[in-house]
Each structure stands twice: as C-alpha cells, then as structure tokens.
Amino acid sequence: GALEVQVPEDPVVALVGTDATLCCSFSPEPGFSLAQLNLIWQLTDTKQLVHSFAEGQDQGSAYANRTALFPDLLAQGNASLRLQRVRVADEGSFTCFVSIRDFGSAAVSLQVAAPYSKPSMTLEPNKDLRPGDTVTITCSSYQGYPEAEVFWQDGQGVPLTGNVTTSQMANEQGLFDVHSILRVVLGANGTYSCLVRNPVLQQDAHSSVTITPQRSPTGAVEVQVPEDPVVALVGTDATLRCSFSPEPGFSLAQLNLIWQLTDTKQLVHSFTEGRDQGSAYANRTALFPDLLAQGNASLRLQRVRVADEGSFTCFVSIRDFGSAAVSLQVAAPYSKPSMTLEPNKDLRPGDTVTITCSSYRGYPEAEVFWQDGQGVPLTGNVTTSQMANEQGLFDVHSVLRVVLGANGTYSCLVRNPVLQQDAHGSVTITGQPMTFPPEA
C-alpha cells in the first residue's frame, strides 16, 4: 500500500555554479489535492532538512535559500527540487519523502563536477640541458572537481609511469589543483605530454613540452637509439633501430656489435670478427648487413610475440665503446566487444539485468568503460576480469549489473592503452515487456 516514489537511478551531474534539478515524482490518485500532500527533501546521511511542502503550502528552503520546488507541477506528481548555484559541498544523496495517505521515499544522488584548466608545464632545470641529464617536468591544472587522474606519455603516446608523483591541493570551495611531477633522464630529444582527466566529466585536458638538449662531447662511440619505445603488433616484424657514426677509413673488421636483453644480459644477436654470428634468440633476429658499414646497427625481430616485450641493448665497439637501450612495446588490438544480456527475455522496468561485454586477444590489458545512452559513465556494479592465454594475449570480460528503466542504451568501450584503440559495443533495451535480442 506504499506510495511509489520515482527518482533517477543514475547520479545527477551538475557543474559548480550551475543549477541542478533533482527529479522526484509520484502518481497522484484521482481527486488528489495539494492540501493532502506532505513533501520533504532532506540530506540522506545527516537527515538535515533541505525543503518541504506541507498543509498546502511551500514551506520554503531550509538549505541556504538555494532550493525551490516546481509549484505548478506538484499537483501532477512532480516533486522535483531545483538546487541553484551548485557548490562542491552540495554533493551527496538527497531523499525525497512523499506522504499523501500512504508514504514513500527515494534517494537521488548529486554528483558535482568542475572542469580542469589546460595544464601548465614547467621544466627544471630549463637550460643547458644535455642527453643524460635528469630533468623534472611539472604539470599543473587548476580548479577542477572531483580529483583528477594524471597520465604522462611520450611523443609516441607510450605511457610513462615510473618516477611520477601526483599531489592534490583543495581550496576553500573544495575545488582541486593537481600537480604532477615527472622525473626523466633526457635522450637525444623528446616530447612529454601530460593529460589531466576529470573522471566524472570524462574531460581530458592536455599539454606537452618538447625538449631538444645540446649534444654532449664525448670520446666514446655515440650510439643512438629511439628514445621512445618501438611499438610492434603481435605477429608482425619490428625494427629496433640503432646507429653509430663510423669514422673515415672504418671497416667492418674493426666492428664488434652485440645485441642483448638489457635486464637478463641474454645474447640476442652479434657481429664480430667481420662476420654476422647469427641469431641467439629463437632464430627470429637479423641485422641489415648491407647497411652496417654506414653505421646502421639496427636489429630486425620477426613474428613478434608478447614475451619479446622489454628492453634490448645495442653495444658497439670499434676502438671506443658505446651502448644504448631501446624498448620494445608489444601490442595487439582487441576485437569488437560482444554483448550478452542475462536474463534476456520478458524484461520489465525495475528488473536487474547483467550485461556482459567481452573482447578478445588483445595486449596489453584493456581498460573497460561503461556509459549510458547520454554518455554518462556507469561506474557502480561493474566487475572487469582479464584472462591471459598461452601466448600472453588477454581476453577481457566486463560485467555491468543494472536496474532497467523504461528503456536504455548501455555502451561498453574497451581501450587498448598502448594503441589508444577503442573498441565499442552497445545494447539498447526498449519496450515492456522486452526480449533480447529483439525479435525480427
């Protein structure tokens, strides 16, 4: 016999300083008059009164005079609350209590957000830089909410996760300034990008800095490799570039070239005594013999596997000696997600359904994002699991549990963080009762 009070299941997202409507409705019976209505809005956790309507009259705002009802719509069952000039402190759960003869209540969540500014970048030290110097790059973004995630990447889009320190500072209004510090050892040159992501707005603010240091004079052989990781798709061939500058009169008889795994020192390939000594690495490596005399010591790695990922060091010795390490980042695209629904027939609003999004044979592990038809992120009741096969590729399965509304679209986005490849799948559930997949 209770009164059914309806509110949106998903949080209401409001930007700081704007107005928000917390929707709440009930179904008035025939002959209903406002004199019968008791309506109370209060903060769910603290029970603080926000706004009320009783004895046929709007009792006004008890919440900083920033709330209002919709008086012309109350008689039709619209008990929504307007909250003006939203502040961070307003965030939380609001309960709508409706009493006529029977009584009902429901809680609606307010999620406050504020976009972050375009990041500013600073460099320390910022002059007389040479390869091998350690520099500190600071990325700062201001006046956002809620806390930001900060991602660093190099010029090829490869994530930089080591030696990153991120801190937040809250101001009196509850907005955040985020400061992220990246410490890097400079290569020949490099671009460093900082991305500040607002997790509610899914807003990304980017900035980057490109550093071209001066050459360092040295007696050693200068060995050059790409500063950024080489990204290779599983099953394809990859070239790990390495070069040196041969002096006039240089002959291959003088050259000792060794490629090895940086961490384990396992021999990969070598050229000594004027001859290619061949592959010591599963017979999948080769040099470029016609280019060696011009200083091209690059290594070709065939049929790349996940297990190949890592750092390879190129050692060059003529009279002097030099070495440099190049990183191989392996990747594999994820398949278009397949979507399944359980239960998948006779569905009605209010039913709890499990939507599974599966994407296969990718690398590295995927991030999975869910959102509704309006593009609002769905983060609650999501369980994501990864399964690795014998080749080291991943299958990702993400399960979303939702209570159905009258209709709805649920989208799953599987992101490969290295390839920045997004694979999408979605399911639209409409009608009442409904069946999935829809019958022809």
Epitope: E91, P146, E147
Partner: antibody
C-alpha cells in the same frame, strides 16, 4: 550510527603479506573517500593510504608503503581493503580505517577501533 | 610535503585550568586543519575541522582558531575526561595527509 570495523590483523614474519578489511555501515559508503591510518606502539598517527569516492579508484600512499601496499574498495559490500605485501618490522602498528569528511575535505570524522599488525621474526 | 609541529610536547595542568595547544605548519594550509583527541587504547576522535568548526557532539569548551600556518586548540576548563593526547592534521594537500607529533595533556 556510523560504524567502521577493521579485521585481518595478526602476527606475520618479515616479507609476508596480510590483507586488512574494514566493514562500513551507517552512511552511504560509496559517496566518501576512505583512508587507512596507522599508529606504531607508543608513537603518533601516520596516514598510510587514501582512496577517493565512487568507483574512480584514485589512490594515494605514504612514501613508506608505496609499492608494497594497495588500497581498494568494494562499494557493493561497503568494505575497504588494504593489501600489505613485503611487510617489514617497521610496519608493526595498529591500523585504523577512517572515513573522510567529504571527498574534498580529508579530515577523518569517523574511525574504527583498529586492528593490530605485528611483523616479527 | 607539509610538516606540522605541535607544541608543547607535554602540558601538565590541573582540572579546571585552561589548556592552549599550538600547531604550526611548514607552509600555509588555509583553514584546512583538524584536531583530534586520543585516549589510551582508543581510536582518535575528531574535535575540530576547518580550523574552528566543532565536530558533532563535541562540548563547547573545545575551540579552535588560526589560519595559514599558526593554529591553536583551546580547552577552556579542563575536565578529567580531557586528559589525553591531541593531534593536528592538515588536509589542504596530499599525499601525504600529515599529522603533527601530538601534545600530551596530563594531570599535574
């Protein structure tokens, strides 16, 4: 009434692992950032880790535990966790679960009673 | 990292006396400072947040003041249950969310 109840403490050897849990009730758990704070015997309070609200899983750690401890939360179970790996003698302390006043005001308005972790060979 | 320094380390007073505890921050924390009370064998309890706002159910003999880098917790008339250790904590900037070293208020 807000309640935070920690569990999972005990005696372990250096290098071993332990997982602490904190069961929360009396408030909308997912709407609040949560923290672990520890107190070594006879010492002051030391903040250990924080996880922000909802499902955003933005986490922070004290330098002393970074890379060894992992904070997580299960909003469906109203539970906060602290996975502690590679434990050291200096990790011996009472570990408190503490609720942030809000996501932007990280004072600790409610605390659990604590669970004792002893790392000893 | 913001360092909080509490003084004195120990305060010896009699019931009924006024206690004044100090907390100094190494850089400004605005008004984002909290005070806690901890009795032996118990969890800490929030007394003050926002430098001067009393938490729920905290008696009005406890008051906080200050902003920026200098803060004070005052207990106007000590009761027997007020003898405990008091900590300040900043929450303007993290990580870390730092605490002061504590001030012990003991019976003279």
């Amino acid at each position: 009434d807000v309640q935070l109840v920690e569990s999972g403490g005990g005696v372990v050897r250096p290098g071993e692992s332990l997982r602490l849990s904190c069961a929360a009730s009396g408030f909308t758990f997912s709407n609040y950032a949560m923290n672990w704070v520890r107190q070594a015997p006879g010492e002051g309070l030391e903040w250990v880790s924080r996880i922000n609200y909802k499902g955003y899983n933005i986490t922070y750690y004290a330098d002393s535990v970074k890379g060894r401890f992992t904070i997580s939360r299960d909003n469906s179970k109203n539970t906060l966790y602290l996975q502690m790996n590679s434990l050291r003698a200096e990790d011996t302390a009472v570990y408190y679960c503490a609720k942030s006043g809000s996501n932007s005001n990280n004072f600790f308005d409610y605390w659990g009673l604590g669970t004792l972790v002893t790392v000893s060979s | 990292e913001i360092v909080l320094t509490q003084s004195p380390g120990t305060l010896s007073l009699s019931p009924g006396e006024r206690a004044t505890l100090s907390c100094r921050a190494s850089q400004t924390v605005g008004s984002k400072l909290a005070w806690y009370q901890q009795k032996p064998g118990q969890a800490p309890r929030l007394l003050i947040y926002g430098a001067s706002t009393r938490a729920t159910d905290i008696p009005d003999r406890f008051s906080g003041s200050g902003s920026g880098t200098e803060f004070t917790l005052t207990i106007s008339s000590l009761q027997s249950e007020d003898f405990a250790v008091y900590y300040c904590q900043q929450y303007i900037n993290w990580p870390p969310l730092s605490f002061g070293g504590g001030t012990k208020v003991e019976i003279k």
